[in-house]
Interface confidence: medium
C-alpha cells in the first residue's frame, strides 16, 4: 500500500516549525490533545455552518461529535471527528505547506516569545499550527479524512516527509477525519484511560460538541443460569423437608448476578455553553478557565462582563479584556481583521472574522456573542450586512466601556492604561457617539503629581475657582513639557497643567471640543488669559505702553518677516521670550510629529502655509535682557549688536518653544558673534 502512495517533502519552513514546536514544548507534551480537540471542533463548526445552507452536507454522517479511542495492544491513539473533512488536495496543502499554517508569522512570534522567556504553548493554537504538536508524542501520524467533495484519503508522516494515498477501504468515515497517533515509547501513558479522560475533561470543557472517550466500566448484569447449575439447584430442593407450592416455584431465579466489563462511548463534556448559563451560577474560576480555553491565552483576563442584551435584538455575551496587549496591536491598525469576537447564532458558531463586530479601537477585546435573532440559513456575506449586527455592535461597545469603567482605579491606572491607553485615545478620535464616555477613561500626566496619572474628572475637580479652561502642554517628554516657558506663570499661579507626551495625545485633545463644559487650551498657543483685577489690568496696560517702542521695532525691523506680531507676555516669569502659535497653527510638538510623519512632501499648500505662518513673539518685560534691549533700542534702533541679540533671542525662543530651526548654521554663527562681543574679541579676528 505504501509503495502506491505519493511522497511529498514538507516545506522547509514547516520543518523548521516542527523542530521549534518539539524543542520548545517537550516539557508540555500533553497539549497535543488540546490542539487535536480544538482542530476537531473547528472542523465541526465548519460543517455545521455549511449545513445551514446545504441540506445534503450532513448526509454522509448525521452526527457532529469527537470520539477518542485508545488501542493499547497496537500502541495507537485515535481522535475522530465528523467535521468537514479534507480533500486530497487539502491534506497536502493544509498539513504540508505554509499556505495554511501561518508558519512564518508563527516562527517569528515563537522565537520572540522564547527570547522573552514567555510561554510558547499558547502560540501554537493561536496560529493554527497545533496539528504538528502530535509529533511531541508520536513517531508517526496517520490522518484519514473524508470530505463531501472527494473520496477518502490517508495522509501519513514520520515528521521527515509525508505521503498521501486513496484509502483502499473506501468510505469508512462517512465524513470527517481520524487522526491516528503511533505513540512514542515514552508516551505510552497516553494509552491509559484515566490519563486520557482527565486530559479530555481539562481541554474539552468549553468545546460545543459532544466529546466521547471509548471507556470501560464494570456493570453488574443478570445472566441466565447454565444447565448444570439448574440441575444442582433442583437436587438441593428435593432434599428440602418443606413442600413448596407451585406458584412459589415459578419465582425461583433462572439467572445470576455477574460483574462484567462493558465498553461504550462516555460523554466527557457538558455541552451547554457557559454564556448560556445565568451569570449568577458561573464561578469566577469558570470564567477564567473559559477565557484561557477560547482565547488560547495562558494569563487570566484583566476584566470580564457576562450579560444578556434585550430589546431590538436579544443576545448573550461574555467579553474579556486581556491582561496584556497582543503583540503588534497597532500593526496595520484598522486594516487587519480582529478574530477576537466569536459570533454564534443559536449556539452555532458562525464566524470570528466579521470586521465590524467591534470598532477598531477596541481590537483587543475578546469574547463571544450568541444571538437567537439573527438568521441561520443565509450566507456569511448576507449576514455581515444584517442590520441587527449594527445594534449588537453598539451594545457590545457600551458594555465594553462599562466593563472598562468598572476596573478598579489602581488596576486601571497601573495596568489597563499602560496596555490599552492608546486605544482609548484613538476611540476619542474615532467614536463620536461614545466620546464623552471615552473621555472619562482618559489618563494623562500632569503638574499635580510627579508620577501619578490623572483623569480629566479629577483635573476638573481641582480647577481653580475662576478657571474656565483645561490647560495642556504637549512635548516629546514630560521633562520637555514641564520645563517649557509656556507653563512658567501657570505653575507659579497654582494652575494645573496636563502634559501630553505621546504623538496621539494632541490629536486626541483636538477631537474633544470640551470636557464637562470646559474647553481645552493649548498653553503654547494664543488664548491663554488670566483673571486680573482692575489694578493689575492698569499695570499691564502701562507696561505695554512702556514697551511699545521695542515691540514695534521687533515687528517692523529686527524680526520683520519672521513674526506676526510682538506682545508683552502674561505667561512668562523666568524666560525672556517665547514663540506662540496661532489658534490653529501647529504647536512645536505637532510640528515635530508632522515632520516625523513626513507630511511635508511635495509642493502642497501645507508647505506654503507653514513656511509663511508667522507666530506671535512674546516678551517678558521683567527680564533684564528685555529691559536692556528696550533701553538700547530707544538710544539707537540701528544698533547692529541689538539687532543680532533680537534674532538670537528669536531663534532661542523658537527652540525653547519646541519648534525646529530652519537654519542652524546661521544660528551658530550669531551665537559665536555674541560670544566674541561679550569677551571683547574682534568679530573679524581669525
Amino acid at each position: 500500500l505504501r509503495e502506491k502512495s505519493e511522497k511529498f517533502a514538507f516545506q522547509a519552513e514547516v520543518n523548521r516549525m516542527m523542530k521549534l514546536i518539539i524543542n520548545s514544548l517537550y516539557k508540555n507534551k500533553e497539549i497535543f490533545l488540546r490542539e487535536l480537540i480544538s482542530n476537531a471542533s473547528d472542523a465541526l463548526d465548519k460543517i455545521r455552518l455549511i449545513s445551514l445552507t446545504d441540506e445534503n452536507a450532513l448526509a454522509g454522517n448525521e452526527e457532529l461529535t469527537v470520539k477518542i479511542k485508545c488501542d493499547r495492544e497496537k500502541n495507537l491513539l485515535h481522535v475522530t471527528d465528523t467535521g468537514v473533512g479534507m480533500t486530497r488536495e487539502e491534506l497536502v496543502k493544509n498539513l504540508g505547506t505554509i499556505a495554511k499554517s501561518g508558519t512564518s508569522e508563527f516562527l517569528n512570534k515563537m522565537t520572540e516569545a522564547q527570547e522573552d522567556g514567555q510561554s510558547t504553548s499558547e502560540l501554537i493554537g493561536q496560529f493554527g499550527v497545533g496539528f504538528y504538536s502530535a509529533f511531541l508524542v508520536a513517531d508517526k501520524v496517520i490522518v484519514t479524512s473524508k470530505h463531501n467533495n472527494d473520496t477518502q484519503h490517508i495522509w501519513e508522516s514520520d515528521s521527515n516527509e509525508f505521503s498521501v494515498i486513496a484509502d483502499p477501504r473506501g468510505n469508512t468515515l462517512g465524513r470527517g477525519t481520524t487522526i491516528t497517533l503511533v505513540l512514542k515509547e515514552e508516551a505510552s501513558d497516553y494509552l491509559e484511560l484515566d490519563t486520557i479522560k482527565n486530559l479530555v475533561r481539562k481541554y474539552s470543557q468549553f468545546i460545543n460538541f459532544p466529546i466521547y472517550v471509548w471507556s470501560s466500566k464494570t456493570e453488574t448484569v443478570e445472566e441466565p443460569l447454565e444447565e448444570d447449575e439448574t440441575a444442582q439447584e433442583e437436587k438441593e430442593e428435593a432434599d428440602d423437608e418443606a413442600a413448596v407450592e407451585e406458584e412459589e416455584e415459578e419465582k425461583k431465579p433462572k439467572t445470576k448476578k455477574v460483574e462484567k466489563t462493558v465498553w461504550d462511548w462516555e460523554l466527557m463534556n457538558d455541552i451547554k455553553p457557559i454564556w448560556q448559563r445565568p451569570s449568577k451560577e458561573v464561578e469566577e474560576d469558570e470564567y477564567k478557565a473559559f477565557y484561557k480555553s477560547f482565547s488560547k491565552e495562558s494569563d487570566d483576563p484583566m476584566a470580564y462582563i457576562h450579560f444578556t442584551a434585550e430589546g431590538e435584538v436579544t443576545f448573550k455575551s461574555i467579553l474579556f479584556v486581556p491582561t496584556s496587549a497582543p503583540r503588534g496591536l497597532f500593526d496595520e491598525y484598522g486594516s487587519k481583521k480582529s478574530d477576537y469576537i466569536k459570533l454564534y447564532v443559536r449556539r452555532v458558531f458562525i464566524t470570528d472574522d466579521f470586521h465590524d463586530m467591534m470598532p477598531k479601537y477596541l481590537n483587543f477585546v475578546k469574547g463571544v456573542v450568541d444571538s437567537d435573532d439573527l438568521p441561520l440559513n443565509v450566507s456569511r456575506e448576507t449576514l455581515q450586512q444584517h442590520k441587527l449586527l449594527k445594534v449588537i455592535r453598539k451594545k457590545l461597545v457600551r458594555k465594553t466601556l462599562d466593563m472598562i469603567k468598572k476596573i478598579a482605579d489602581e488596576k486601571y491606572n497601573d495596568t489597563f492604561w499602560k496596555e490599552f491607553g492608546t486605544n482609548i485615545k484613538l476611540g476619542v478620535i474615532e467614536d463620536h457617539s461614545n466620546r464623552t464616555r471615552l473621555a472619562k477613561l482618559l489618563r494623562f500626566q500632569s503638574s499635580h503629581h510627579s508620577t501619578d496619572i490623572t483623569s480629566l474628572d479629577q483635573y476638573v475637580e481641582r480647577m481653580k475657582e475662576k478657571q474656565d479652561k483645561i490647560y495642556f502642554m504637549a512635548g516629546s517628554s514630560r521633562k520637555e513639557a514641564e520645563s517649557s516657558p509656556f507653563v512658567e506663570r501657570l505653575l507659579k499661579k497654582g494652575y494645573e497643567v496636563i502634559y501630553l507626551t505621546e504623538p496621539v495625545d494632541e490629536y486626541c485633545i483636538q477631537a474633544l471640543p470640551e470636557f464637562d463644559g470646559k474647553r481645552f487650551q493649548n498653553v503654547a498657543k494664543e488664548g491663554v488669559k488670566f483673571d486680573e483685577s482692575e489694578k493689575s489690568k492698569e499695570s499691564r496696560e502701562a507696561t505695554e505702553k512702556e514697551f511699545e517702542p521695542l515691540l514695534n521695532w521687533m515687528k517692523d525691523k529686527a524680526l520683520k518677516d519672521k513674526i506676526e506680531k510682538a506682545v508683552v507676555s502674561q505667561r512668562l516669569t523666568e524666560s525672556p521670550c517665547a514663540l506662540v502659535a496661532s489658534q490653529y497653527g501647529w504647536s512645536g510638538n505637532m510640528e515635530r510629529i508632522m515632520k516625523a510623519q513626513a507630511y511635508q512632501t511635495g509642493k502642497d499648500i501645507s508647505t506654503n502655509y507653514y513656511a509663511s505662518q508667522k507666530k506671535t513673539f512674546e516678551i517678558n518685560p521683567r527680564h533684564p535682557l528685555i529691559r536692556d534691549m528696550l533701553r538700547r533700542v530707544k538710544e539707537d534702533e540701528d544698533d547692529k549688536t541689538v539687532m543680532d541679540l533680537a534674532v538670537v533671542l528669536f531663534e532661542t525662543a523658537t527652540l525653547r518653544s519646541g519648534y525646529l530651526l530652519p537654519d542652524t548654521k546661521a544660528y551658530g554663527d550669531r551665537i559665536e558673534r555674541m560670544l566674541r562681543l561679550s569677551l571683547n574679541i574682534d568679530p573679524e579676528a581669525q
Epitope: F330, E332, Y333, G334, S335, K360, L426, I429, E430, H432, R435, E506, Y507, Q510, A511, P513, Q583, Y584, G585, W586, M590, Q597, A598, Y599, T601, G602, D604, I605, S606, Y609, Q613
Partner: antibody
C-alpha cells in the same frame, strides 16, 4: 503633478451596493488625510467621509454612517468608498479630495474630477 | 439645511468689489480654520482660500479672506467675467466630528 482619478460610479438600484475607487499619483499618498465629498445634481457640496494616513481612523457624515465604509490601500495609492444600502438621496457626483493639513482640519487642496453615482429603480 | 450659512446669490459688475459671507458657530468657524472653494460650471471645486486668509500659489490676490468670531467672508475685488462661479465656505466642526460646507453662493458678473 498631483492627480486624483475616481472610478466605480454608475447606475444602481435602491438597496444596492457600489464601490468607488480613487487612484492617486504625483505625491506620497500614505502621508495624507483623504476624504470623499459629494455633490447632488444642482446642489451644494457635502463632505461624506475621511480617513487618517496610517492609523486607518475614519470619520463619517451622519447621513452615511453605518452604510458607507471608507478605506485605503497605501501600497496601491488608492482610496475606496464602499457604499451599501444605497438610497435615491445618495445620487451625486462623488469627489475624492486630499487634505494636507490634518489634524489642524484644514482644506482640500486637490480634488478629482468626480464619478457619478445614480441610485434609481 | 447647511451647517454654515451663505447667501444663495451675489452679483456685481466688472471691476467692482463683492463680498460673500459665511456664518457658523463656535464649534466650527469659531474655533477652526475656514476655507473657500470656487466651482466653475461643470468642473470640480478648486481651493481659493485656506486658514481663513491664506491664498494657495496661483490664486490671484484679488481674492481675500477674513474671519471674525463665528463669521467669515470672502472678498473679490476687480471683478471679472471669469469669476462667475459657485463659491463655498468650509470648516471642521468639532461637535459633529465632520467637515461642513456652506450651501454655496452663486456669483453672477453682470
Amino acid at each position: 503633478e498631483v492627480q486624483l482619478l475616481e472610478s466605480g460610479g454608475g447606475l444602481v438600484q435602491p438597496g444596492g451596493s457600489l464601490r468607488l475607487s480613487c487612484a492617486a499619483s504625483g505625491f506620497t499618498f500614505s502621508n495624507y488625510y483623504m476624504s470623499w465629498v459629494r455633490q447632488a445634481p444642482g446642489k451644494g457640496l457635502e463632505w461624506v467621509s475621511g480617513i487618517y494616513p496610517n492609523s486607518g481612523s475614519t470619520y463619517y457624515a451622519d447621513s452615511v454612517k453605518g452604510r458607507f465604509t471608507i478605506s485605503r490601500d497605501n501600497s496601491k495609492n488608492t482610496l475606496y468608498l464602499q457604499m451599501n444600502s444605497l438610497r435615491a438621496e445618495d445620487t451625486a457626483v462623488y469627489y475624492c479630495a486630499r487634505d494636507p493639513l490634518h489634524p489642524a482640519r484644514f482644506p482640500f487642496d486637490y480634488w478629482g474630477q468626480g464619478t457619478l453615482v445614480t441610485v434609481s429603480s | 439645511q447647511s451647517v454654515l450659512t451663505q447667501p444663495p446669490s451675489a452679483s456685481g459688475t466688472p471691476g467692482q468689489r463683492v463680498t460673500i459671507s459665511c456664518t457658523g458657530s463656535s464649534s466650527n468657524i469659531g474655533n477652526n480654520a475656514v476655507s473657500w472653494y470656487q466651482q466653475l460650471p461643470g468642473t470640480a471645486p478648486k481651493l481659493l482660500i485656506y486658514a481663513d486668509s491664506h491664498r494657495p500659489s496661483g490664486v490671484p490676490d484679488r481674492f481675500s479672506g477674513s474671519k471674525s468670531g463665528t463669521s467669515a467672508s470672502l472678498a473679490i475685488s476687480g471683478l471679472r467675467s471669469e469669476d462667475e462661479a459657485d463659491y463655498y465656505c468650509g470648516a471642521w466642526d468639532a461637535s459633529l466630528n465632520a467637515y461642513v460646507f456652506g450651501g454655496g453662493t452663486k456669483l453672477t458678473v453682470l
